[in-house]
């Protein structure tokens, strides 16, 4: 992580601790699947991490922004449109859809702080919601009625 | 959220902004299933939120600690040991296991801060890893070999 200058909130902006109180951003997953041992394909493995054994398998994609806290986020990306058959682990079963589980999470962006006379006084953190996909889930398709 | 006194890190403790940089804690899921419309049972619905349409359905359990940031965390709890059949959505298929997707996330605990002479000077935030379950995933069981 690069070093950030200390935060100097100006009047009307949250203090760091106030921001901390609302800070709610996932860390990178424990360990994305090793590409060599678990190639990224539409199949459900019988070993390896959860995301490769799932019948809605997914990979993790790094989203890095040095002006954001956290700087590194990971997005799940489904490897199949449908669920993989439990019987074979390889062919898809169109009766199930592989859907992303989304999560609106709070992130903080580094923005220049301005003093009372508009002078630049370090950096402040601006809180925003940021949509991240956590995993792929095998679901029954919605029935329109 | 209750109001917390301002943080006064003592020597050797991270500043709020340093902590912020590492703060990585999920917010509550978008909307836990409404209990009435989607009763918590081992079946995959054809409507409703993702956690009730999943063939590894789950519910959310609130974990509240007023001395922790965030104060509210949600843990997924699987409603079935196995995956639900895509054919019917009502009975289990023992060829698939419903497993929790875990996530070690950083939380902050409010602890009294002590000045140089041991005097109490407000509260500081202590960073810790905290295991949270995000969702239940239908997986092929591990093959022991």
């Amino acid at each position: 992580y690069s070093h950030w200058p200390s935060c100097c909130p100006s009047k009307g902006q949250d203090t760091s601790e106030e921001l901390l109180r609302w800070s709610t951003v996932p860390v990178p997953p424990l360990e994305p699947a090793r590409p060599n041992r678990h190639p990224e394909s539409c199949r459900a493995s019988e070993d390896g991490p959860l995301n490769s054994r799932a019948i809605s398998p997914w990979r993790y994609e790094l989203d890095r922004d040095l002006n954001r806290l956290p700087q590194d986020l990971y997005h799940a990306r489904c490897l199949c449109p449908h669920c993989v058959s439990l019987q074979t682990g390889s062919h898809m079963d169109p009766r199930g859809n592989s859907e992303l589980l989304y999560h609106n999470q709070t992130v903080f962006y580094r923005r220049p702080c301005h003093g009372e006379k508009g002078t630049h006084k370090g950096y402040c953190l601006e809180r925003r919601l940021y949509r991240v996909s956590l995993a792929c889930v095998c679901v029954r398709p919605r029935v329109m009625g | 959220y209750s109001h917390w006194p301002s943080c006064c890190p003592s020597k050797g403790q991270d500043t709020s902004e340093e902590l912020l940089r590492w703060s990585t804690v999920p917010v509550p899921p978008l909307e836990p299933a409404r209990p009435n419309r989607h009763p918590e049972s081992c079946r995959a619905s054809e409507d409703g939120p993702l956690n009730s349409r999943a063939i590894s359905p789950w519910r959310y359990e609130l974990d509240r600690d007023l001395n922790r940031l965030p104060q509210d965390l949600y843990h997924a709890r699987c409603l079935c040991p196995h995956c639900v059949s895509l054919q019917t959505g009502s009975h289990m298929d023992p060829r698939g296991n419903s497993e929790l997707l875990y996530h070690n996330q950083t939380v902050f605990y409010r602890r009294p801060c002590h000045g140089e002479k041991g005097t109490h000077k407000g509260y500081c935030l202590e960073r810790r890893l905290y295991r949270v379950s995000l969702a239940c995933v239908c997986v092929r069981p591990r093959v022991m070999g």
């Epitope: 019987q87 | 959505g89 009975h91």
Partner: antibody
């Protein structure tokens, strides 16, 4: 060889509950999808629902609010209850064993001989 | 729900004829299709399961084919005992549904 036999009243009054029992002989009641199917006079077949392993049930959405299928393993029987009946529920009611193929209900075999239930006051 | 459409709804044929009945599903059902024979006053009897597998004890003149949405039941040489009504049934998704039936009558 598994055989199924339906029993129950042949006449039910409107708004009352139709109750039928199917007795299974010559085989185990475990690990099958015990099902009910009906056929109105001169018409086609309609699946009502099943009970699997004395636990999970699945009903035709068109009847779901009125149907209960339960299994009594001690008696090797399963039963159908259909509430708030009307003349439209007049039919021959069949019980059948839903074959368990790859943990799914696959086909019906064997069937009971069927019992005609008339809804009339 | 998956709709099952059978054609024709009835047909007349003679003993020894080759008879073909078709069943169409409103969406792909892979090979999750079964065929039944029903005689008047009797319960249906399973003939073919999983689109093309002959049930034990059923004469080999009966055969099934197809996958996806279009399926066929063929009786290679019609026998007197084959005059009956035939139903297709999908087991791809619940609710399980049947076709409207095809009545095979003596010409």
């Amino acid at each position: 060889q598994v055989q199924l036999q339906e029993s129950g009243p042949g006449l039910v009054k409107p708004s009352e509950t139709l109750s039928l029992t199917c007795t299974v002989s010559g085989g185990s009641i475990s690990n099958y999808f015990w099902s009910w199917i009906r056929q109105p006079p001169g018409k086609g077949l309609e699946w009502i629902g099943f009970n699997y392993n004395s636990g999970s049930t699945n009903y035709n959405p068109s009847l779901k609010s009125r149907v209960t299928i339960s299994v009594d393993t001690s008696k090797n029987q399963f039963s159908l209850k259909l509430s708030s009946v009307t003349a439209a529920d007049t039919a021959v009611y069949y019980c059948a064993r839903g074959y368990n193929w790859n943990y799914e209900i696959a086909w019906f075999d064997p069937w009971g001989q069927g019992t005609l239930v008339t809804v009339s006051s | 729900d998956i709709q099952m459409t059978q054609s024709p709804s009835s047909l007349s044929a003679s003993v020894g004829d080759r008879v073909t009945i078709t069943c169409r599903a409103s969406q792909s059902i892979s090979s999750y299709l079964n065929w039944y024979q029903q005689k008047p006053g009797k319960a249906p009897k399973l003939l073919i399961y999983a689109a093309s597998s002959l049930q034990s004890g059923v004469p080999s003149r009966f055969s099934g084919s197809g996958s996806g949405t279009d399926f066929t039941l063929t009786i290679s040489s019609l026998q007197p005992e084959d005059f009956a009504t035939y139903y297709c049934q999908q087991s791809y998704l619940t609710p399980l549904t049947f076709g409207g039936g095809t009545k095979v009558e003596i010409k």
